[in-house]
Amino acid sequence: IPVIEPSVPELVVKPGATVTLRCVGNGSVEWDGPPSPHWTLYSDGSSSILSTNNATFQNTGTYRCTEPGDPLGGSAAIHLYVKDPARPWNVLAQEVVVFEDQDALLPCLLTDPVLEAGVSLVRVRGRPLMRHTNYSFSPWHGFTIHRAKFIQSQDYQCSALMGGRKVMSISIRLKVQKVIPGPPALTLVPAELVRIRGEAAQIVCSASSVDVNFDVFLQHNNTKLAIPQQSDFHNNRYQKVLTLNLDQVDFQHAGNYSCVASNVQGKHSTSMFFRVVESAYLNLSSEQNLIQEVTVGEGLNLKVMVEAYPGLQGFNWTYLGPFSDHQPEPKLANATTKDTYRHTFTLSLPRLKPSEAGRYSFLARNPGGWRALTFELTLRYPPEVSVIWTFINGSGTLLCAASGYPQPNVTWLQCSGHTDRCDEAQVLQVWDDPYPEVLSQEPFHKVTVQSLLTVETLEHNQTYECRAHNSVGSGSWAFIPISAGAHTHPPDEFLFTP
């Protein structure tokens, strides 16, 4: 650590005195202190001399000697008072800038330590300090306003009692800056704008910050617009608003608009797009396939996206058949607005019944006209199977009818014993019917197919089973010939005699 001579913490001299401060260290040393007149600095290796032969009150201050090469950063200090009867204060700065909640040091240094008992801090023109101003005083450093607030941005003077009268320092302006968390907050409204040529439009760009020092501008396709700025202060924030009013829009007004605000912390920008169209428009679309297939008993939501300007004057969902004249319940229809010009309309169809298959149409209207979007809903069913014994052209034939959607495939099985359902161990023979005859196939209905199995002789201790399957499920019917005649078994049902 460097050593200062004279080796005292404080030195009191009179104006005009010669002052010599010497600092010695192991390596090179540096003096530092407040800017003040008349000092001569002389450095010689490991020592440095700070001297004046005409000390004034302005030399009052703390002088510190450091050793730049010292890794511990040690330093020594001495405080010099130049005791001037006419000048109790040496003010080192006429403006102090701090952030809110920092301590603000007003650097009026007392030139005579004896005066410490009679010092006070006041606002200029003798006005008292604001309430709740918490401050302390150090003769070496001045007055400290603790946890300074923005409202304490004022002009202050330091006061000392000399011979029964108050002697004021020159004033010190305190600027307490709001802590700026980041660039100004921005809003640009609307987020999107559509107008028909000739209509009026308004775009509002506004920025706000806790500090007044920020800039805001609106630009159109990278061209800065000259717009008068409105300023305001409320909720402890400064606001600057730019309003672009267009009485009759044309195509050249279309394009990208950016609202940009900047301060010392950086820049924020937000953009919107302005579209100018020749006439009203109404577009309907869906992300879903317009042809829907759903298993009976399940639910379905039909969604339509609407893009329109001007806004919709009417809309509804309609059931177009073919099964009944019922209409969708209004409570199952839902509308959500994605933004000003785009909406989503949803029709919820829970636990679909056979009679609800068919066409559903969404209709919407605006000044541009009517538009419709139609969905076709087909229900899927697992196959239902039945088998009968009959004679065709004199031959004994098993006839299997299967009904379901999608169209079922048919497989015949012959197995030993009497059973409701052939299992693998019992199977004697398997026939696939690749092309069963389609008996009926109408839109939105089940498909019914028929498969024939010609049997020369029915084996009485055997079972003949017709199995049908599709993507939804499967069904089967077991036919059991008995001595009294041919019997059939639907799955999980009692034997019966036709």
Partner: antibody
Framework: QVQLQESGPGLVKPSETLSLTCTVS????????WSWIRQPPGKGLEWIGY???????NYNPSLKSRVTTSVDTSKNQFSLKLRSVTAADTAVYYC???????????WGQGTMVTVSS | SSELTQDPAVSVALGQTVRITCQGD??????ASWYQQKPGQAPILVIY???NRPSGIPDRFSGSSSGNTASLTITGAQAEDEADYYC????????????FGRGTKLTVL
């Protein structure tokens, strides 16, 4: 060894605010006075003002109405704000360490700021 | 506030001695500091206080003061000394304000 580094935008539009930051490395900002000095192209040096770690400031009278300097000891940085700039504020801006008001013994390398629309 | 006056340009033959001067009322109370600046570079402190050289500054640079005039002397000027030289001091208002001279362009012939 103490080093100074200026940073900030190189282009500022007329009437806007010029904002620069000087980062002190290799030493503490909580000692010494720290100054801003500028030099217009082809011209001499002009002192703008200084700031002390406590927030004390002093400014060139010709710029005082437009200047604010401040210090952030936690980041070891001090900054300059010059409001309502014009083309006449186009210059290389330097930050420097001030020793006792006697000399600027350490300088940043300078940053060119152009004021133009 | 005070002004500091410098000659705009001075030239010196290689190896010769040259004196650059700075005049101003504030120099009666304050010593001047001197800075060397080469094109495209930041200024460098060469002399401060009564006659102090920062480390790394050759001893051919020296400073002196008399009345309201401060002088920077280069004894045995070298080609690398060609640069602009600026003086500065506090002004005499007592408000700790800083003033610079307008600079002297030194040419080494």
């Amino acid at each position: 060894q103490v080093q100074l580094q200026e940073s900030g935008p190189g282009l500022v539009k007329p009437s806007e605010t010029l904002s620069l930051t000087c980062t002190v490395s290799g030493g503490s900002i909580s000692s010494y006075y720290w100054s801003w000095i500028r030099q217009p192209p082809g011209k001499g040096l002009e002192w703008i003002g200084y700031v002390y770690y406590s927030g004390s400031t002093n400014y060139n009278p010709s710029l005082k109405s437009r200047v604010t300097t401040s210090v952030d000891t936690s980041k070891n940085q001090f900054s300059l704000k010059l409001r309502s700039v014009t083309a006449a504020d186009t210059a290389v801006y330097y930050c420097a360490r001030d020793r006792l008001g006697i000399a600027f013994d350490i300088w940043g390398q300078g940053t060119m700021v152009t004021v133009s629309s | 506030s005070s002004e500091l006056t410098q000659d705009p340009a001075v030239s010196v033959a290689l190896g010769q001695t040259v004196r650059i001067t700075c005049q101003g009322d504030s120099l009666r109370s304050y010593y001047a500091s001197w800075y060397q600046q080469k094109p495209g570079q930041a200024p460098i402190l060469v002399i401060y206080g009564k006659n102090n050289r920062p480390s790394g500054i050759p001893d051919r640079f020296s400073g002196s003061s008399s009345g309201n005039t401060a002088s920077l002397t280069i004894t045995g000027a070298q080609a690398e000394d060609e640069a602009d030289y600026y003086c500065n001091s506090q002004d005499n208002s007592g408000n700790h304000l800083v003033v610079f001279g307008r600079g002297t362009k030194l040419t080494v012939l």
